[in-house]
């Protein structure tokens, strides 16, 4: 679709005669004919296949054509064509004279025409204008004329339809050529696809305007890049939605479970070393002087009975000092100047002579200990209980006791409430301080997995436009994980139609 | 079942201070990124500011910058705003919301959010 425009510009009449060489009365009142054809090689009369059009009287015998209207009529002329501009033309311009108001070719006399030219020839799409004189023996016509393509239509046949737009079916203006030329922010054959906003991710964004990052469930963070770890993880980490990777000393489905509680809670006291012993569990090994589940407890350096042979052990600032009965000397009255003779041993120890009578051994009964057989056996000083147990002297035994969730002699086993097995329909058990826990599997739920509960969340298929549904067992609920062009929930809407803002 | 509950919001006179509060349950608050949208009498929301999820990372709109400070107590589940120098056209009713969308300028897109608070600036 175009316009084939002709201006007209000047029309000489010198002597204001007829074709016919007759004179007009009172001088020629001159209009024009124009048609426009099909390429003919001799322009013979015939229908005006690409249109015609007519001027109103423009002056008289010899005048110039203004560029706007003149008398109502316009200066170019317009001859629209909706069809492919074929690049040839015939044209067919005719003055006439108009002796009176009625332009219409009935209405005239058939001497009335002043002159006719015809051209033909080859023309392409342009902006500019082809300037042309036609010459007869009484008269001359200068013109210009060209073809431009009507509004939309681009191209060099004015073939190409292209209107501007910026709504949900495409963002451009048109090149002269007519191709597309996409709006800033929009991109695709069409211009309907936005740019999102730089550096959002490709797969877990996107975006239904310029400059924007949405992202897809599980995903968040300003361009969409940063997982969000299942519901319920404490001490853990994701590489892709919904994961729960613990942190180093941290356990358990959630890593909520404390497995390095030495370094979390710091709990051994006065420089003791602490060691791991399982969740929530440890020991502490106490420097010298100090005792206690977590070396809490300040020792007397007496307190390890360090004086033998009735030695009475008395405390220092810096250290002990042994006051030793007569017949004994030493640090800790460990040398004797007594012999058998002096019957040393107590509680029914038996004496045996060493180094020729210089000097004795006491060989006691059970339960009893020292040079002199003078101690009763303390079972506990060797600090037998391991995990916290209490050491506690029964007789010629002892015993520990033990801290929750341990048992053993020496309190070395770590109860394990899991051993039952008390976990039903396949859920899987974990030991805690004070019990245990159960993780049910899908479609199980209470204390014990004992109750039923309902099936894959995803067995529905509850996401539309063939997105993919994943179950959060947890929840018992889906995630739908939306393709390109469409979000909601579960994936209803196009991308094209936002959800709105909740307020 | 996911709950935001935002409090602390009241009557304040120009270049006076308020304290904003969200308590969050039902959800994994400390996973989550957590943002305060605005919404003036007639008009749309406004995005204020936002936080990631570990609290070292914040984002402010231009009206507020220098004038908010937004932070985060992951063990107690709470998100603040702390509003200095209040001007009357920071009135409004404030809300926190988690962010799953963002524009140019900050967050436009959210998943949870809470029944809001009103903050009055007028003298």
């Known amino acids: 679709s175009g316009v084939f425009q002709l201006q007209l510009q000047e029309f000489i009449n010198e002597r204001g005669v007829l074709a016919s060489g007759r004179p007009c009365e009172p001088g020629c009142r001159t209009f024009f004919r124009v048609c426009l054809k099909h390429f003919q090689a001799v322009v013979s009369p015939g229908p005006c296949t690409f249109g015609t059009v007519s001027t109103p009287v423009l002056g008289t015998n010899s005048f110039a054509v203004r560029d706007d209207s003149s008398g109502g009529g316009r200066n170019p002329l317009q001859l629209p064509f909706n069809f492919t501009w074929p690049g040839t033309f015939s044209l067919i311009i005719e003055a006439w004279h108009a002796p009176g108001d009625d332009l219409r070719p009935e209405a005239l006399p058939p001497d009335a025409l002043i002159s006719k030219i015809a051209i033909q020839g080859s023309l392409a799409v342009g902006q500019n204008w082809l300037l042309d004189e036609q010459t007869s023996t009484l008269t001359r016509l200068r013109y210009s004329y060209r073809v431009i393509c009507s509004d939309n239509y681009y191209g060099d046949n004015c073939s190409r339809l292209c209107k501007k737009r910026n709504d949900h079916f495409g963002h451009y203006v048109c090149q002269p050529d007519g191709n597309l030329s996409c709006l800033p922010g929009w991109t695709g054959e069409y211009c309907q696809q936005p740019i999102c906003l730089s550096g959002c991710h490709e797969q877990n964004g996107y975006c239904s305007k310029p400059a924007e990052c949405l992202c897809r469930p599980g995903w968040q963070g300003r361009l969409c890049n940063e997982c969000i770890p299942h519901n319920g993880c404490r001490h853990g980490t994701c590489s892709t939605p919904w994961q729960c990777t613990c942190d180093e000393g941290w356990g358990g489905l959630f890593c909520d479970q404390d497995l390095n509680y030495c370094t979390h809670h710091s709990p051994c006291k006065n420089g003791a070393t602490c060691s791991n012993s399982g969740q929530r569990s440890y020991t502490c090994t106490c420097r010298p002087g100090y005792t206690g589940v977590d070396c809490e407890l300040e020792l007397s350096e007496c307190d390890s009975n360090p004086c033998r042979n009735g030695g009475s052990c008395k405390d220092q600032e810096d250290g002990y000092h042994c006051l030793c009965p007569p017949g004994y000397y030493g640090l800790h009255c460990e040398h004797s100047t007594l012999s058998c003779a002096d019957s040393p041993c107590f509680n029914g120890g038996s004496c045996r002579e060493r180094n020729q009578g210089a000097n004795y051994a006491c060989e006691c009964p059970p339960n009893f200990t020292g040079s002199n057989c003078e101690k009763k056996v303390d079972r506990c000083t060797s600090n037998p209980c391991a995990n916290g147990g209490q050491c506690l002297n029964r007789g010629p035994s002892r015993m520990c006791r033990c801290r929750p969730g341990f048992t053993g002699t020496y309190c070395e086993l770590h109860v394990s409430d899991c051993a039952r097995n008390p976990c039903a329909h396949g859920g899987t058990c974990h030991d805690l301080e004070n019990g245990l826990m159960c993780t049910c599997p899908a479609g199980f739920s209470g204390r014990r997995c004992e109750v039923r509960t309902s099936i894959d969340a995803c067995a529905s298929s509850p996401c539309f436009n063939r997105a993919t549904c994943y179950t959060d067992l947890s929840t018992d609920t889906f995630v739908c994980n939306c393709p390109y062009g469409f979000v909601g929930s579960r994936c209803e809407f196009p991308v094209g139609l936002p959800p709105s803002f909740p307020w | 079942e996911v709950q935001l509950v935002e409090s602390g919001g009241g009557l304040v006179q120009p270049g006076g201070s308020l304290r904003l509060s969200c308590a969050a349950s039902g959800f994994t608050f400390g996973n989550y990124d957590m943002s305060w949208v605005r919404q003036a009498p007639g008009k749309g929301p406004e995005w204020v500011s936002a936080?990631?999820?570990?609290?070292?990372?914040?984002y402010y709109a231009d009206s507020v910058k220098g004038r908010f400070t937004i932070s985060r107590d992951n063990a107690k589940n709470t998100l603040y705003l702390q509003m200095n120098s209040l001007k009357p056209e920071d009135t409004a009713v404030y809300y926190c919301?988690?962010?799953?969308?963002?524009?140019?300028?900050?967050?436009?897109?959210?998943?949870?959010w809470g029944q809001g608070t009103q903050v009055t600036v007028s003298s």
């Open positions: 919301a988690t962010p799953r969308g963002w524009g140019p300028t900050g967050p436009h897109e959210y998943g949870y």
């Open positions: 936080i990631n999820s570990g609290g070292d990372t914040t």
